[in-house]
């Protein structure tokens, strides 16, 4: 099939006191090839800070996947999820709020 | 290979402004952030500031956050440093650096030597 | 902001010899968040070792690092004439990002 571009959606939960889970997702992607990994100040936190979701077909042909953090409340300026699908790249900040959900398609 | 070329260096005035230019190559150029250190004569390094040239974030040293203006034009690929009410102590060499996988600073520029005198 | 302290601030040995610099940080930093980088007269710095132990690309295995907490160490087990230069130490914890003031090696 022909290639088409993942949805990346950042999203932000409270954890313990003076921290939060930010959680990246991309979905409807295909190929299921992905790179999905968050960075502080532009670099790649090592793996043992990072959880990810096994990639899975979301029933549309195409798939989904997720990546996970945790930081602390008041840094979430230096954090930045990167996202490299089949040949293209994006970067997507941390919402500010709960209620701030961002929703991109990148071609 | 990747490369990062600075622009030629620079005599100014106390009070002026300074604009360095850094032209990354052999990489996608939104895909890692841009940082500026700087370097006295004789001196250590000191981190200035970074651009995400992808989401446009900027993120300052506050010993600079006055003073310096980072920004990226992403038709040409190139990241700009601009230093303004210059003195005397700022003379240095300026370099600009790609943030890396694992490391804050992977590749450097060749470096841009501003002279302030009067 | 970290300080991070280096000593010596000028190491003098012969090539053949080990090196030994020291970098202490004024407040505790994870492992994956200190770096070493290596600069000659007239050059910008390069990337010798991150995440305090691992080699960047191209850099010899007389190379090494360790560390943690507050107290990190380079060492060059035997110095070649090109390893004379000064060292950086760098954190990435926390802002600002900063270097160490740097350990000159030169020829004893």
């Known amino acids: 099939g022909s290639t088409v571009p993942p949805m990346v959606n950042v999203t932000r939960s409270e954890a313990s006191e003076g921290n939060i889970t930010v959680t990246c997702r991309a979905s409807s992607f295909y190929p299921r090839n992905i790179i999905l990994t968050w960075r502080q100040d532009g670099v790649s936190l090592s793996h043992d800070t990072q959880q990810w979701g096994d990639v899975l077909p979301d029933g549309n042909g195409t798939y989904q996947t997720w990546v996970a953090t945790r930081i602390c409340r008041g840094e979430e300026q230096r954090f930045t999820c990167y996202m490299e699908h089949s040949g293209n790249h994006s970067t997507h900040p941390v919402p500010s709020g709960n209620s701030h959900h961002h929703h991109h398609h990148h071609h | 290979e990747i490369q990062l070329v600075q622009s030629g260096a620079e005599v100014k005035k106390p009070g002026s402004s300074v604009k360095v230019s850094c032209k990354p190559s052999?990489?996608?150029?939104?895909?890692?952030?841009i940082y500026w250190v700087r370097q006295a004569p004789g001196q250590g390094l000191e981190w200035i500031g970074y651009?995400?040239?992808?989401?446009?974030?900027?993120i300052y040293n506050q010993q600079f956050k006055d003073r310096a203006t980072l920004t990226v034009d992403k038709s040409t690929s190139t990241a700009y440093m601009e230093l303004s009410s210059l003195r005397s102590e700022d003379t240095a060499v300026y370099y600009c650096?790609?943030?890396?996988?694992?490391?804050?600073?992977?590749?450097w520029g060749q470096g841009t030597l501003v002279t302030v005198s009067s | 902001e970290i300080v991070l302290t280096q000593s010596p601030a000028t190491l003098s040995l012969s090539p053949g010899e080990r090196a030994t610099l020291s970098c202490s940080a004024s407040s505790s930093i994870s492992s994956n968040y200190l770096h070493w980088y290596q600069q000659k007269p007239g050059q910008a710095p390069r990337l010798l070792i991150y995440?305090?132990?691992n080699l960047a690309s191209g850099i010899p295995a007389r190379f090494s690092g360790s560390g943690s907490g507050t107290d990190f160490t380079l060492t060059i087990s035997s110095l070649e004439p090109e390893d004379f230069a000064v060292y950086y130490c760098q954190q990435g914890g926390s802002l600002p990002l900063t270097f160490g003031q740097g350990t000159k090696v030169e020829i004893k």
């Open positions: 995440r305090t132990s």
């Open positions: 651009i995400d040239p992808y989401i446009g974030r900027i």
């Open positions: 650096s790609r943030s890396g996988e694992r490391s804050n600073f992977d590749y």
């Open positions: 052999g990489y996608a150029f939104t895909s890692n952030n």
